[in-house]
Amino acid sequence: KAMHVAQPAVVLASSRGIASFVCEYASPGKATEVRVTVLRQADSQVTEVCAATYMMGNELTFLDDSICTGTSSGNQVNLTIQGLRAMDTGLYICKVELMYPPPYYLGIGNGTQIYVIDPEPCPDSD
């Protein structure tokens, strides 16, 4: 009955501060409405990074000011987090909720450790 969620253990953000990873869930029911939330865990504190609810077969829509974008395909969600800095390095957890129709199901991944390295500033040319 419990829902399993899989995500990669480690991802390295690009030099532009963009990190992408796949969040895949094994659906125990036939959900038509799914909510995906990205959580960040640091020092045992958990905060919400972004969230989107989507209809199966439709695109994910995050809020306009969200740092996340994503696409869905079946039971797989491709998530992209933008604007990351070195201080944002941490564990990013994918949380999936099957909202409709009932029953509700919750699935939480083990987290993806995202490493962000700030680019070195370009040296001044003489």
């Epitope: 939330t37 949380k95 009932p102 029953p103 509700y104 199901y105 939480i108």
Partner: antibody
Amino acid sequence: EVQLVESGGGLVKPGGSLRLSCAASGFTFSSYSMNWVRQAPGKGLEWVSSISSSSSYIYYADSVKGRFTISRDNAKNSLYLQMNSLRAEDTAVYYCARVGLMGPFDIWGQGTMVTVSS
Amino acid sequence: NEVLTQSPGTLSLSPGERATLSCRASQSVSRYLGWYQQKPGQAPRLLIYGASTRATGIPDRFSGSGSGTDFTLTITRLEPEDFAVYYCQQYGSSPWTFGQGTKVEIK
């Protein structure tokens, strides 16, 4: 301080109605799903109903389906439970509880007592 | 519906002793299991979530273990304030269900 405070409990006759309220403070109420959980005298905990942050998704226990209605007003930081066709077996302390980001019920109110008796 | 069975119903122990409480699920709940403490006249308080993660502010004498169908809450050295009723809860699917509770009383 993160806090939930229930009100509206009391004595009501079988078949009667009651509306419970839960006032939230100290956190962004509109970001969290909320629940009602009850506890009959000397008994264990029983989940009653759940409502998502934007009220889009609502769930009920079979024991109250068709009789109870959960709702919320995010502008007022308040959660409600409208209870109709009350029965003696609905007698309990009713708690409102917040759903934490990782799933469990992480913050609870102090409860309000509902007694259904003739 | 997921049924959670707690054992024993009552545990009689002295302060300083170790308490081991069990919770068994009728089907796998993975690690979507929480433990709550309730004292007389008070609301439940979250102790453990995700089967083994302590909630904020919970002392390290409380620990949780298990996954699937069998779970354990351990209190390593009972303090006077730990005598209470403990409930397990599964939150992986609706309806959300609780065990019937284990009372930890002073021997």
